[in-house]
């Protein structure tokens, strides 16, 4: 067992004339995904076959939007690698498909839009254990670059994860017959895997995967006893030395194969013929289509409609994920303006706009002062979302219509008293003040601290505030 | 290799409930779907409920509000609470189990459900 890794370094145009166009736009931002479909050996397959070492697809990358006039860079790339777990031997020869989707981001109906950008293919020698591949593929305009390698899991070893290692049990060396497993010189390699379901009392094996019987005993898989009485129609001649076999289970008998898979009995063991979407030892493993139900929260599946093609979810607003299993938090981007109030009603987002606001987003200004007067010659000033009145002297109140008290805030310092007056206020101010607002004191001799006062006014008189 | 265990199929009268469960065991990548589909004698197989290891959940038109899917994670399984069972319902339902990362996915041998009076 292992996994099959791919970095993808970078999807843009290739090299020479006719550079691509950005498969983005201001009014359609998108984003990349990737899917890789992995098939043993190097036959020429159609793209539609079975992916069966395995497939995979990417996150989605980051949103892009075209700059106009730019031309189309290398685009931004989703995260991570793309695994493709495989559970049995890697097979060193192999067959790769590497697909570029667009999923666009527009405010179209059903979600977003799908689309295949590019699809590149390739048939490549590779060992288990090795250094990172790098490849460079074209498709049209297209350039993708990438690497790869497969690496075994633990305990498995070699070039194609078949060999085991185990840590070693004694400090000094490995148990009788087991070598120290390169490269990992402090772990041993394990006795052979033999068969699955070989039995452990019966059974042996010198190659991986085979099941060799002792003496009594038969069947591929070591579980029956070959019988000592005399016997009509055996199945082949006995080991034991008097009698035959039973006619007991062949390969084939009880049908070991899975969803409507033929057995037929090989030399060895037996072989199953699966029906289309089906593959695997047994049949057991089958591709995902839209026939699964992948696609959650009303996400509408396309493609997959038959066994050995991929499927894709469209999401409907407010959910995403390869198969629209997540929430968006729609309000998190605050798309509401001007402090407006964001609410995600499930099917819509809606926005409460502040007083003076309006538009879906809350992006229109109002005109406050259209259609407002203030009175008594007020000035009407825009602002926040709410007109506001500007008063002349004398007048105040929303719209200038109250008479102003301009004593009111007692504007007159140090004890000084004040008078309403038809041009304003007249600070009458207390002994040793002056000014219009009796902010100044009178030193004792006479003078008066900054400003002097004006010609014919004697300190103490009142002070008319212009 | 992911291997699937059924079990709870029986007969039941009209009415009556049901519930299936499903226990997943070998490689059960984290991010994966499992659910129930089943078929009925002559007929394809369809899905009946499936549930996404993240809780998101999708159920056949036909059996809302009379079924009910639900898994625990950290035992790999699925459960199917079946009520108000109708004749209709008699199929083999069978236990499905497949991986996101990989679009791979495997089906368990099957338990026969027989709605009867």
């Known amino acids: 067992a292992g996994v099959f890794e791919l970095q993808i370094h970078s999807f843009g145009p290739g090299p020479g004339p006719g550079a691509p166009r950005s498969p983005c736009s201001a009014r359609l931002p998108c984003r990349l995904f990737f899917r890789v479909c992995l098939k043993p050996g190097l036959s020429e397959e159609a793209a539609e076959s079975p992916c069966a070492l395995g497939a995979a697809l990417s996150a989605r990358g980051p949103v892009y939007t075209e700059q106009p006039g730019a031309p189309a860079p290398d685009l931004p790339l989703p995260d991570g690698l793309l695994q493709v777990p495989f559970r049995d031997a890697w097979p060193g020869t192999f067959s790769f498909i590497i697909e570029t989707w667009r999923e666009e981001l527009g405010d179209q109906i059903g979600g977003p839009a799908w689309s295949l950008l590019a699809r590149v293919a390739g048939r490549r020698r590779l060992a288990a254990g090795g250094p990172w591949a790098r490849d460079i593929q074209r498709a049209g305009a297209w350039e993708l670059r990438f690497s790869y390698r497969a690496r075994c899991e633990p305990p498995a070893v070699g070039t194609a994860c078949t060999r085991l290692c185990r840590p070693r049990s004694a400090p000094s060396r490995c148990g009788p017959g087991l070598r120290p497993c390169a490269p990992l010189e402090d772990e041993c390699e394990a006795p052979l895997v033999c068969r699955a379901g070989c039995s452990p009392e019966h059974g042996f094996c010198e190659q991986p995967g085979e099941c060799r019987c002792l003496e009594g005993w038969t069947g591929p898989l070591c579980t029956v006893p070959v019988s000592t009485s005399s016997c009509l129609s055996p199945r082949g001649p006995s080991s034991a030395t008097t009698g035959c076999l039973v006619p007991g289970p062949g390969p084939c008998d009880g049908n070991p194969c899975a969803n409507g898979g033929s057995c037929s009995e090989t030399p060895r063991s037996f072989e199953c013929t699966c029906p289309r979407g089906f593959y695997g030892l047994r049949c057991e493993v089958s591709g995902v289509t839209c026939a699964d139900g992948p696609c959650f929260n009303g996400g509408l599946c396309v493609g997959g409609a038959d066994p050995d093609s991929a499927y894709i979810c469209h999401c409907p607003p407010g959910f995403q994920g390869s198969n629209c299993e997540k929430r968006v938090d729609r309000c998190s981007l605050q798309p509401c303006r001007n402090g407006g109030l964001c609410l995600d009603l499930g099917h819509a987002l809606r926005c409460r706009c502040r007083a003076g606001f309006a538009g879906p987003r809350c992006e229109h200004d109002l005109d406050d002062c259209a259609g407002r007067a203030c009175a008594n010659g007020g000035t009407c000033v825009e602002g926040g979302g709410a007109h506001r009145c500007s008063c002349a002297l004398g007048f105040g109140g929303r719209d200038c219509r109250e008479r102003a008290d301009p004593c009111a805030a007692r504007p007159c310092a140090h004890g000084g008293r004040c008078y309403a007056h038809f041009s304003g206020l007249v600070c009458a101010c207390a002994p040793g003040y002056m000014g219009a607002r009796c902010e100044f004191p009178v030193h004792p001799d006479g003078a008066s601290a900054l400003p002097a006062a004006p010609p014919g006014l004697r300190p103490g008189d009142p002070q008319r505030y212009l | 290799e992911v291997q699937l265990v059924e079990s709870g199929g029986g007969l039941v009268q009209p009415g009556g409930s049901l519930t299936l469960s499903c226990a997943a065991s070998g490689s059960t990548f984290t991010s994966n779907v499992m659910g129930w589909h089943r078929q009925a004698p002559g007929k394809q197989r369809e899905l009946v409920a499936n549930?996404?290891?993240?809780?998101?959940?999708n159920y056949a038109d036909s059996v809302k509000g009379r079924f009910t899917i639900s898994r625990d994670n950290a035992k790999n399984s699925v459960y199917l609470q079946m009520n108000s069972l109708r004749a209709e319902d008699t199929a083999v339902y069978y236990c499905r189990w497949y991986g996101i990362q990989r679009a791979e996915g495997y089906w368990g041998q099957g338990t026969l459900v027989t709605v009867s009076s």
């Open positions: 549930m996404h290891s993240g809780g998101s959940t």
